[in-house]
């Protein structure tokens, strides 16, 4: 199970993981105490048939070709959490692990 | 965490799970001994901003709007395995649980 890694200089057109730093301060999300920014990454690129398909199911749907199935798209296939310190709606400070905040791998599904 | 369920008569344009029976016999995939067909389902539809977003990350990438990020697409967000009986490449009969063969829920990611 692998995925491509690219950067802003890459000429890769296929599904790839790109670096992206999310800056909560720039968004004006000041209820987030820490971190103020983190490396989130994102997925972008084309999904040619079979390339980086995460699931056998993706191939089977392509084979069956039902009405309205758009073909696979480049999406996170492995994600990881980050620890965050933030205010909840009741203005209590919460420290917790927030799931699926970082893209570790991209694939076609 | 929920997703929409549709059928061939639905007028829903948003991201939805549709029924699909995969027929291995019709594909000529005779190395699969059993099942000969199974209910796989598939995802199709539009991902308007925030609708059925699986991860907070999806929202953050939209907010950061990096070059080449295409916006979320309708993709499986929950999948389940099926048991299969099949011949491997060495012509041995294998009985095993094959992961991610059935779409249980669709969402935007």
């Amino acid at each position: 199970d692998f995925g491509l890694d690219c950067d802003e200089h890459s000429t890769e057109s296929r599904c790839c993981r790109y670096p992206l730093t999310v800056d909560f301060e720039a968004f004006g999300w000041d209820w987030i105490i820490a971190p103020k920014r983190y490396k989130a990454n994102y997925c972008s690129g084309e999904c040619e048939f079979v390339f980086l398909q995460k699931y056998p199911h993706t191939h089977l749907v392509h084979q069956a070709n039902p009405r309205g199935s758009a073909g696979p798209c480049c999406t996170p296939t492995k994600m990881s959490p980050i620890n965050m310190l933030y205010f909840n709606g009741k203005e209590q400070i919460i420290y917790g692990k927030i799931p699926a905040m970082v893209v570790d791998r991209c694939g076609c599904s | 965490d929920f997703g929409l369920d549709c059928d061939e008569h639905s007028t829903e344009s948003r991201c939805c799970r549709y029924p699909l029976t995969v027929d291995f016999e019709a594909f000529g995939w005779d190395w699969i001994i059993a099942p000969k067909r199974y209910k796989a389902n598939y995802c199709s539809g539009e991902c308007e901003f925030v609708f059925l977003q699986k991860y907070p990350h999806t929202h953050l990438v939209h907010q950061a709007n990096p070059r080449g990020s295409a916006g979320p697409c309708c993709t499986p967000t929950k999948m389940s395995p099926i048991n299969m009986l099949y011949f491997n490449g060495k012509e041995q009969i294998i009985y095993g649980k094959i992961p991610a063969m059935v779409v249980d829920r669709c969402g935007c990611s």
Partner: antibody, heavy 124, light 107 residues
């Protein structure tokens, strides 16, 4: 509909060989195991073996292993059972039967269709 | 090889009777047991699979039960067309083995 049609009756001398055919129709021949079962006159049923037409993988009853060969012709959807070195106690009706899986476990199947049987008489 | 012992070997009964045929395996066969009906000069016909499941198209007067080593076939109300020979088969292990048969005759 699913059908198995077997070749006609044979009379053979001891020591000879016989090749019984079983022509399948109404389904994808290559994707289902074919079994062979025999029945001596007035006796019970005896399993001889099976073959998977897609790849020709076969499994024989040890009792017959040295004398039996199961083959298929995918182009005509026909299964064959050849028995060599015939003896008088090989006189029997030979049946082919399709193995149908109702589930996915290795033993989750039953015989859903049988051929009409082929009588093989071994006599000097 | 797994031995399948069927009893009785023959049975006389009348139309309308309820009859039971038993099959005992020499070891646990995990309910992988089928029952067949055979009429003279004809191929066997599958009735029951996995010990108690009825094959499509088989009338519900036929029923199967049992687990482990002991299994039974019951015909609830005999009709003239039910007089035949019945066989059990274990498919838990190769080689597959049949019971020796039970001949059901009209009294």
């Amino acid at each position: 509909q699913v059908q198995l049609v077997q070749s006609g009756a044979e009379v053979k001398k001891p020591g000879a060989s016989v090749k019984v055919s079983c022509k399948a129709s109404g389904y994808s021949f290559t994707g289902y195991f074919m079994h062979w079962v025999r029945q001596a006159p007035g006796q019970g049923l005896e399993w001889m073996g099976n073959i998977y037409p897609y790849n020709g993988v076969s499994n024989y009853n040890q009792r017959f292993k040295a004398r039996v060969t199961m083959t298929v012709d995918k182009s005509t959807s026909t299964a064959y059972m050849e028995l060599r070195s015939l003896r008088s106690d090989d006189t029997a009706v030979y049946y082919c039967a399709r193995r149908y899986y109702y589930g996915t476990g290795p033993a989750d199947w039953y015989y859903d269709v049988w051929g009409q049987g082929t009588l093989v008489t071994v006599s000097s | 090889d797994i031995q399948m012992t069927q009893s009785p070997s023959s049975l006389s009964a009348s139309v309308g009777d309820r009859v039971t045929i038993t099959c005992k395996a020499s070891q646990d066969i995990n309910s992988y047991l089928s029952w067949f009906q055979q009429k003279p000069g004809k191929a066997p016909k599958s009735l029951i699979y996995r010990a108690n499941r009825l094959v499509d198209g088989v009338p519900s007067k036929f029923s199967g039960s049992g687990s482990g080593q002991d299994y039974t076939l019951t015909i609830s109300s005999l009709q003239p067309e039910d007089f035949a020979t019945y066989y059990c088969l274990q498919s838990d292990e190769f080689p597959l083995t049949f019971g020796q048969g039970t001949k059901l005759e009209i009294k």
